[in-house]
Interface confidence: low
């Protein structure tokens, strides 16, 4: 895996990006064994975990150019219920499908500038970015 | 939120640690409503979306001061099977109880060299990182 | 004085790859970055990406998929490959450098352009 | 995408005269750090490639005549060319280079009138 060049200072590296925005083809982060076409209110017996699960989801891809990682994916719950283990397809209103939401480290590019004002490449601001990892077939809440 | 400093060169930037390691105390990423002792085999009815899960799991802290974000937290999954949502307690062997991973962008500190070798601050490394996000209710792989 | 020349062919079938090529002489490629950018008949300037002396590029999301830019240091050469192309990617297509030897400013230097029609 | 608007679409100015155009960028392109408009104006004549004419908004490039200039901050821009000439008879297209995709906007014609 072709790591992104390292936060360095550029001057006297003639050889090397460093501190440019990596625009070197990456791998795109998706999630593993990612289903786009799970659409339907249903658990498979077989596909990837997010058709398999009683709470399926699918991906939605969210691209900025000017982020690390510049492909992030949130779920999207395809049934307000969980799905009866049972059939796979009829939902079971005892459970609830609910979105996992993790507050993720990523970095937007900003452009970076040297004692004059000169353009000096790329600076990365670290910023907490939302996003929902999954749905989950959770029981209600019962209110106090 | 205090973010990270930027990658800059650091060279003219005398009042700022452009390039230096953030030791400033950083919030923990803690997923939403952290829980940690959520450690039996059952579904709450209230509580974190860990707890009230038909698959319950717990979270590990996995720390490196080396890595951004310093703070990951890895699922662990507390029941092998999915517990009934009847119940809320029994488990339900027709369901699996299963970890959702996800390669996670991280980056890790590591010192870096001018021109003539002398040390320039530190660099950041972009790495894939295996964390486990939640563990989901699925149905069984039908082996064709 | 930096000058840049296209050159490539000026007819392309349809479905095929448009293939071009900027050669850069009173200067060296290194150090710089370089662009294309294209222009329809009688319309605007639309940047298809950038690539830098070192191999990196970034493509318009909007021709991402069909973009390859890729640079020859040893030639003092960069070339765009556009695959699978209509009607639509008829233009005159332009190399530019810019504005700086080590980021992305404004496009300071650019070829003549070269006129690249699709049709069968 | 950062979308780059212009207008108008086309004028027609006296030798001698002003003219004004202008330019609008979806969302900012001013740095707030070093207070910087990642702009540039470029001149594009009949049968020629473009003309980097001026940079950061308000910076000409080195050759390029005084009675162009360039002003505005934020999302609105303007390109003025205090005395009109023959020879400034093109089209004008505004760029960002704040990110990626760098986008221009549709470019105004000015003429002779």
């Known amino acids: 895996y072709s790591h992104w060049p390292s936060c360095c200072p550029s001057k006297g590296y003639p050889s090397e990006e460093l501190l440019r925005w990596s625009t070197v083809p990456v791998p795109p982060l998706k999630p593993a064994s990612l289903d786009f076409h799970s659409v339907s209110c249903r658990a498979s017996e077989d596909g990837p975990l997010n058709s398999r699960a009683i709470s399926p989801w699918r991906y939605e891809l969210d691209r900025d150019l000017n982020r690390l990682p510049q492909d992030l994916y949130h779920a999207r719950c395809l049934c307000p219920h969980c799905v009866s283990l049972q059939t796979g397809s009829h939902m079971d209103p005892r459970g609830n499908s609910e979105l996992l939401y993790h507050n993720q480290t990523v970095f937007y590019r900003r452009p970076c500038h040297g004692k004059k004002g000169n353009h000096k490449g790329y600076c990365l601001e670290r910023r907490l970015y939302r996003v929902s990892l999954a749905c989950v077939c959770v029981r209600p809440r019962v209110m106090g | 939120y205090s973010h990270w400093p930027s990658c800059c060169p650091s060279k003219g930037y005398p009042s700022e640690e452009l390039l230096r390691w953030s030791t400033v105390p950083v919030p923990p990423l803690k997923p939403a409503s952290l829980d940690f002792h959520s450690v039996s085999c059952r579904a709450s009815e209230d509580g974190p979306l860990n707890s009230r899960a038909i698959s319950p799991w717990r979270y590990e802290l996995d720390r490196d001061l080396n890595r951004l974000p310093q703070d990951l937290y890895h699922a662990r999954c507390l029941c092998p099977h999915c517990v009934s949502l009847q119940t809320g307690s029994h488990m339900d062997p027709r369901g699996n109880s299963e970890l959702l991973y996800h390669n996670q962008t991280v980056f890790y500190r590591r010192p870096c060299h001018g021109k003539k070798g002398n040390h320039k601050g530190y660099c950041l490394e972009r790495r894939l990182y295996r964390v486990s996000l939640a563990c989901v209710c699925v149905r069984p792989r039908v082996m064709g | 004085q930096v000058q840049l020349q296209e050159s490539g062919p000026g007819l392309v079938k349809p479905s095929e790859t448009l293939s071009l090529t900027c050669t850069v002489s009173g200067g060296s490629i290194s150090s710089y970055y370089w662009s294309w950018i294209r222009q329809p008949p009688g319309k605007g300037l639309e940047w298809i990406g950038f690539i830098y002396y070192s191999g990196s590029t970034n493509y318009n999301p909007s021709l991402k998929s069909r973009v390859t830019i890729s640079v020859d240091t040893s030639k003092n050469q960069f070339s765009l490959k556009l695959s699978s192309v209509t009607a639509a990617d008829t233009a005159v297509y332009y190399c530019?450098?810019?504005?700086?030897?080590?980021?992305?400013?404004?496009?300071?230097?650019w070829g003549q352009g070269t006129t690249v029609t699709v049709s069968s | 995408d950062i979308v780059m608007t212009q207008s108008p679409d086309s004028l027609a100015v006296s030798l001698g005269e002003r003219a004004t155009i202008t330019c609008k960028s979806s969302q900012s392109i001013l740095y707030n750090s070093d207070n910087k408009n990642y702009l540039a104006w470029y001149q594009q004549k009949s049968g020629q490639p473009p003309k980097l004419l001026i940079s950061w908004a308000s910076t000409r490039e080195s050759g390029v005549p005084d009675r162009f200039s360039g002003s505005g901050s934020g999302t609105d821009f303007t390109l003025t060319i205090s005395s009109l000439q023959a020879e400034d008879v093109a089209v004008y297209y505004c760029?960002?280079?704040?990110?990626?995709?760098?986008?221009f906007g549709p470019g105004t014609k000015v003429d002779i009138k």
């Open positions: 760029q960002q280079y704040f990110f990626t995709p760098f986008t």
């Open positions: 530019a450098r810019h504005d700086s030897d080590y980021e992305l400013y404004g496009m300071d230097v």
